[in-house]
């Protein structure tokens, strides 16, 4: 099993947006949700 | 507790924008985007798209081409979700939700009650 | 965007005996050895519930008895033990890539 990390760099490239993976509850962003560290 | 409370049930006319509100409670209104999903009457659910309280950066399913807008008022805690142009289809109850991202062990979701919008002429 | 497929659109199970629904994605929703695959639950008159992400994780306060399976394009909801409050459509959803997609639903009903 794939164990997930907040930090762990996964960034989702689509329709030009690029949401760049943080910490979650830092102050980079809101979290997006059902991905693997996405803030916007 | 988190909540997210919605407006009541609009009736608009084909041609006419509706913009439903969810308010968001229990939980620091920056830190979760707000996500916007539509089910008509007896059908499957649809993804409208989202907008980050934070940045008020908004992603939209181009299904609805430019008829949709997501914007937030974070003096009141508030997300709202604009459809202009309402035809018959857009006859549908309306939900904001938001998500915990994937982690070890736990996801919440948590969901509005709904909104049902009714265009009719 | 991606097409998410269900499979059958409507199940009448025995209480206590197994109930299984597909779910097919038109291109893969994994990424990076995770697969971005969710299922919810859909009681009448409420929102939906999340009972499954990552294809095999337990949402949280979800029975034991819902599992979920699958990679790539191919992913499988199981109850292991229907209970009657578990009547409700199940629909799967991808949260890959945006826009994210929902399945079209399965209605499972007691036989």
């Known amino acids: 099993d794939a164990e997930f990390r907040h930090d762990s760099g996964y960034e989702v490239h689509h329709q030009k947006l690029v949401f760049f993976a943080e910490d979650v509850g830092s102050n980079k962003g809101a979290i997006i949700g059902l991905m693997v560290g996405g803030v916007v | 507790q988190v909540q997210l409370v919605q407006s009541g049930a609009e009736v608009k006319k084909p041609g006419a924008s509706v913009k439903v509100s969810c308010k968001a409670s229990g939980y620091t209104f920056t830190t979760y985007a707000i996500h916007w999903v539509r089910q008509a009457p007896g059908q499957g659910l649809e993804w409208m798209g989202f907008?980050?309280?934070?940045?008020?950066?908004?992603n939209y399913n181009q299904k609805f081409k430019g008829r949709v807008t997501m914007t937030r008022d974070t003096s009141t805690s508030t997300v709202y979700m604009e459809l202009s142009s309402l035809r018959s289809e857009d006859t549908a109850v309306y939900y904001c939700?938001?998500?915990?991202?994937?982690?070890?062990?736990?996801?919440?979701?948590?969901w509005g009650q709904g909104t049902l919008v009714t265009v009719s002429s | 965007d991606i097409v998410m497929t269900q499979s059958p659109d409507s199940l009448a199970v025995s209480l206590g005996e197994r109930a299984t629904i597909n779910c097919r994605a038109s291109e893969s929703v994994d990424n990076d050895r995770i697969s971005f695959l969710n299922w919810y639950q859909q009681k009448p008159g409420q929102p939906p519930k999340l009972l499954i992400y990552a294809a095999t994780k337990q949402g949280t306060g979800v029975p034991d008895r819902f599992s979920g399976s699958g990679s790539g394009t191919d992913f499988t909801l199981t109850i292991s033990s229907l209970q009657a409050e578990d009547v409700a459509v199940y629909y799967c959803q991808q949260s890959k890539e945006f826009p994210w997609s929902f399945g079209g639903g399965t209605k499972v009903e007691i036989k």
């Open positions: 907008t980050s309280p934070y940045s008020g950066v908004s």
């Open positions: 939700a938001r998500f915990d991202n994937y982690a070890r062990g736990y996801v919440r979701d948590y």
